[in-house]
Amino acid sequence: EDELQVIQPEKSVSVAAGESATLRCAMTSLIPVGPIMWFRGAGAGRELIYNQKEGHFPRVTTVSELTKRNNLDFSISISNITPADAGTYYCVKFRKGSPDDVEFKSGAGTELSVRAKPS
């Protein structure tokens, strides 16, 4: 069977400060089992933006219902964007593990740029 792919269709997204940004992400398979996380940046310094498994992420809403059976859409919307939100966002699939989940595959990233709010 084909190995799961993480698809982030947009290389870049530009929004005005104060608006919401939609970052798209889709999986090609339900396997392996494990959560999705979104990060801004890569490597050790990356910021956790959303964790499907746990935590409270008040500015993030999921575009589709992630708990829905057979859901493959893991797109998110981030509200009230500020200049500090600019950066490259990665949708990352984790494989369920014990005790910790293991990073399995990352999308190619979507660069979010923030325009000054129109006056």
Partner: antibody
Framework: DVQLVESGGGVVRPGESLRLSCAAS????????MNWVRQAPGEGLEWVSR????????DYAESVKGRFTISRDNSENTLYLQMNSLRAEDTAVYYC????????????WGLGALVTVSS | ETVLTQSPATLSVSPGERATLSCRAS??????LAWHQQKPGQAPRLLIY???NRATGIPDRFSGSGSGTDFTLTISSLQTEDSAVYYC??????????FGGGTKVEIK
């Protein structure tokens, strides 16, 4: 309930070192950025340092850069501040503060730990 | 760097009266402004975030308004327990996170 409890404060001489700890409970510690904020006697609040949720990304105020190191142990739900080459002007109450999301305000504060640097 | 200027430095208000505190930013911070209350000998406590939203458990006599560069914290009917220093914090541009110099609210 969210609880943040600092420890490790005390009296040291200029040039000496001290390590502060902040024990966190009541929330998913590994999902949130954390900060240290200090308050000199009779003065206002001064942000000192921030660490991202995973621990690999750090930021410092210019006044402490190169002398202070922030770190965290997500398995122990603990935040640290290693303070080296302490100066009289570092005398303050040091608070650990939880960040609401990756780019946000501080929604919970610890009770503080007093650090006194005096010869 | 964004500088936050709070005024007045001290505000003396009688119980039951309205207290109005100001925070002005040197450049726009959108709605990314929080207010914290610090009572004597205590840690700060979040009151208001995103300029207008009350934090969990904060009485409705506290309200925030403003956007851009000019913000106001209003205590509609001052209680004796509201005696404290109030700090504004911006989180539009960072690092560094910036706090205002504080406004001390005294009970007449």
């Amino acid at each position: 309930d969210v609880q943040l409890v600092e420890s490790g404060g005390g009296v040291v001489r200029p040039g000496e070192s001290l390590r502060l700890s902040c024990a966190a409970s009541g929330f998913s510690f590994s999902s949130y950025a954390m900060n240290w904020v200090r308050q000199a006697p009779g003065e206002g609040l001064e942000w000192v340092s921030r660490i991202n949720s995973g621990g690999g990304g750090t930021d410092y105020a210019e006044s402490v850069k190169g002398r202070f190191t922030i770190s965290r142990d997500n398995s122990e739900n603990t935040l640290y501040l290693q303070m080296n080459s302490l100066r009289a002007e570092d005398t303050a109450v040091y608070y650990c503060a939880k960040q609401y999301d990756w780019n946000g305000f501080f929604d919970y504060w610890g009770l503080g730990a007093l650090v006194t640097v005096s010869s | 760097e964004t500088v936050l200027t709070q005024s007045p430095a001290t505000l003396s208000v009688s119980p039951g009266e309205r207290a109005t505190l100001s925070c002005r930013a040197s450049q726009t911070v959108g709605s990314k402004l929080a207010w914290h209350q610090q009572k004597p000998g205590q840690a700060p406590r979040l009151l208001i975030y995103d300029a207008t939203n009350r934090a969990t458990g904060i009485p409705d006599r506290f309200s925030g308004s403003g956007s851009g560069t000019d913000f106001t914290l209003t205590i509609s009917s001052l209680q004796t327990e509201d005696s404290a220093v109030y700090y504004c914090q911006q989180y539009y541009y960072w690092p560094p996170y910036r706090f205002g110099g504080g406004t001390k609210v005294e009970i007449k």
